[in-house]
């Protein structure tokens, strides 16, 4: 099939001791090959500071996955979710405020 770029959604949730978990979800993409990673100040975080979900079918012939990392509360602006799919990339910042999210269709 033809390339379908991912929808990218960034959320954050409070955790203990002044840290928050930021999660980046990519969905509705095809083919299944994708790079999803967190960057701090423009540079990719090491693998051992991130958790990845499997790339799974979402039932529509497309795929979904996620990556998460824990960061200090108040440092959200230094982090971006970096997505690479079919030769295209996108950078997705962390929204301010826990009730907000960034939901963006990457063209």
């Amino acid at each position: 099939g033809s390339t379908v770029p991912p929808m990218v959604n960034v959320t954050c949730s409070e955790v203990s001791e002044g840290n928050i978990t930021v999660t980046c979800r990519a969905s509705s993409f095809y083919p299944r090959n994708i790079t999803l990673t967190w960057r701090q100040d423009g540079v990719s975080l090491s693998h051992n500071t991130q958790q990845w979900g499997d790339v799974l079918p979402d039932g529509n012939g497309t795929y979904q996955t996620w990556v998460a990392t824990r960061i200090r509360q108040g440092e959200e602006q230094r982090f971006t979710c970096y997505m690479e799919h079919s030769g295209n990339h996108g950078t997705h910042p962390v929204p301010s405020g826990n009730s907000h999210h960034h939901h963006h269709h990457h063209h």
Epitope: G42, V43, Q77, H89, G90, T91, H104
Partner: antibody, heavy 117, light 107 residues
Amino acid sequence: EVQLVQSGAEVKKPGASVKVSCKASGYAFTNYLIEWVRQAPGQGLEWIGAINPGSGATNYNEKFKDRATLTADKSTNTAYLELSSLRSEDTAVYFCARFLGNYFDNWGQGTLVTVSS
Amino acid sequence: DIQMTQSPSSLSASVGDRVTITCRASGNIHSYLAWYQQKPGKAPKLLIYYAETLADGVPSRFSGSGSGTDFTLTISSLQPEDFATYYCQQFWTTPYTFGQGTKVEIK
């Protein structure tokens, strides 16, 4: 010291192509995205697109998607912008810049491209 | 695309004056806003990022504020070297867009 050094001024005829280079030094070239911006004479700034020098993956402004090609050569720490089918409105100074997370921290000195018959 | 509107487009001021430039986004960009200073024939120079963080080496007379859609750049006491054009830029989503610029001239 982080430095981005761009190629010299170019004069092109309408319909031609131009390739501008941006040589990076003073940091790990493949770790950071390189962005391209242009500025027409007396005008404001316009984002063209970005490239990941490590992978070659690109992100284009839809306005330039059909005519701009971004590439990078890891062996020489150099990023390139090629713009095809030039027209007079493409006369501008073209800048490269390093993307440091969520802003551009270092810029090249700019390359003037003049399109004239 | 998010449109960035700066005001005023130009202003005349004297050395020692307090100068305020505003930038309005057409949508919520959280705090993902940078300010640049540009002098004729030169590349833009980063002044402020994340709406209010001063870049390295930038004098403390420059300050930024705002979040969401409305942002301000203030020069507390204008110096001779501050006469230039100032641009805001949003980093919430691509295409990254700039304000049209504010030219600060000598009165």
